[in-house]
């Protein structure tokens, strides 16, 4: 590492053309973890460019990434998950730019799935449930979920609810009657592990019923 410039202004100028970002996914395939990296500039000519990770690995010093179109990818059990790894972009064996990264701080959970909404007539509410593969995992088990919903006609007016469980109740009185709603959910690590929001789950669409006033009942 002695080749690094020590001047704070210089160090981040280190071949900006090749700046990249990565995310890790733990136990993404059984006990295998994955690491995905990509250049931030989509126009980078990636011909002959390779990625390599060294340090904080089990039994090996370094691992090379596989290239899949414009992304670089590793699937392995060999992440130590403690300490920082050095991830480098290389050409012809020479490093162009490197980043020291702790893989536990760049975790991107898998997207939630099986999102559904059930209307309870007696309770006048909607029970939102979804599933996550992380309930079965041994590392990234604790997540914060972001449930977003909107009236379909309101293009950008998303309402958000954060929760740690996989069940949410929406009160009918807080929704517009006789309206079509879109709802989706994503997740982020929430205990020890840090990182990024997952992809959104597929959206679920549901319609609210009309207001059905009983005799003598007032509109809310």
């Amino acid at each position: 590492e002695s080749g690094y410039a020590q001047n704070g202004d210089l160090e981040d100028a280190e071949l900006d053309d090749y700046s990249f970002s990565c995310y890790s996914q733990l136990e993404v395939n059984g006990s295998q973890h994955s690491l995905t990296c990509a250049f931030e500039d989509p126009d980078v000519n990636t011909t002959n460019l390779e990625f390599e990770i060294c340090g904080a690995l089990v039994e090996v010093k370094c691992l090379s990434f596989r290239k899949l179109q414009e992304i670089y990818f590793i699937e392995t059990k060999k992440f130590l998950l403690i300490g920082k790894s050095n991830i480098c972009v290389k050409v012809g064996g020479k490093s162009l730019t490197c980043k020291k990264i702790d893989l536990t701080t760049i975790v991107k959970p898998e997207a939630p799935f099986d999102l559904s909404v059930i209307y309870r007539e007696g309770a006048n509410d909607f029970v939102v449930t979804f599933n996550t593969s992380h309930l079965q995992k041994k590392y990234v088990k604790v997540l914060m979920h972001d449930v977003a919903y909107r009236q379909e006609k309101d293009e950008n007016k998303w309402m958000h609810v954060n929760l740690s469980s996989t069940k949410l109740t929406l009160l009918q009185r807080n929704l517009q009657p006789e309206a079509m709603y879109e709802i989706k959910v994503r997740s982020i690590p929430d205990h020890y592990f840090k990182g990024f929001w997952s992809e959104w789950s597929p959206s679920y669409y549901f319609r609210t019923p009309e207001i059905n006033n009983s005799p003598g009942e007032m509109d809310p």
Partner: antibody, heavy 118, light 111 residues
């Protein structure tokens, strides 16, 4: 080689503030978080907090919150810890330490003795 | 805060013998196989020195006579065989939860 060099000993009066520096060399400054650890005379070790020189983000032990401020200067690869409203219990050796991972300390400064006395 | 209790507080060992220090935590510091427990050696007038990270990983440059083991709430640092230069205080430290806390220390003396 990787080194953390701290500023010299300080003697302060109760109620005053002290600012201790820690200059890093031998590695890329923004690659590792730097933390501060207190060791009172004849006592064990106590984590005060840490700073990420890349972002300036800090994490403080609740016990020191409100009295401690950590800053970094990327142009000189130096981090600072300022401790205010000093009292006699703050008399200690203060170490800066590099975090090799979350959050263990693989490189330590030589320590700075701070004496608080009226 | 997670409390780390080290035992014994002190021990005297003959050169060539085994020294064992234990560290018990008030709650688990493990996430599956990730054990967030670390060990340091501190000699008088010197800063602490990292020996073991992640419960069992030997820090670069540390002699192989130092080893660590354990999981969840019970961890052990072993020095085998002990040498005269190992006279020092030894501390455990957890990093699963802020504030990152240390044990009270174990003083190892060589007979």
């Amino acid at each position: 080689q990787v080194q953390l060099v701290q500023s010299g000993a300080e003697v302060k009066k109760p109620g005053a503030s002290v600012k201790v520096s820690c200059k890093a060399s031998g590695y890329r400054f923004t690659d590792y978080e730097l933390h501060w650890v207190k060791q009172a005379p004849g006592q064990g070790l106590e984590w005060i907090g840490g700073i990420d020189p890349k972002t300036g983000g800090t994490a403080y032990n609740q016990k020191f919150k409100g009295r401690v401020t950590m800053t970094s200067d990327r142009s000189t690869s130096t981090v600072y810890m300022e401790l205010s409203s000093l009292r006699s219990e703050d008399t200690a050796v203060y170490y800066c330490a590099r975090s090799g991972g979350r959050w263990y300390f693989d490189v330590w400064g030589q320590g700075t003795t701070v004496t608080v006395s009226s | 805060d997670i409390v780390l209790t080290q035992s014994p507080a002190s021990l005297a060992v003959s050169p060539g013998q085994r020294a064992t220090i234990t560290c018990r935590t008030s709650e688990s510091v493990s996430i599956h196989l990730l054990h967030l427990m670390h060990w340091y050696q501190q000699k008088p007038g010197q800063p602490p020195k990292l020996l073991i990270y992640g419960a069992s990983n030997l820090e670069s440059g540390v002699p192989a006579r130092f080893s660590g083991s354990g999981s969840e709430t019970d961890f052990t640092l072993t020095i085998n065989p002990v040498e005269a230069e190992d006279t020092a205080n030894y501390y455990c430290q957890q990093s699963i939860k802020d504030p990152y806390t240390f044990g009270g220390g174990t003083k190892v003396e060589i007979k």
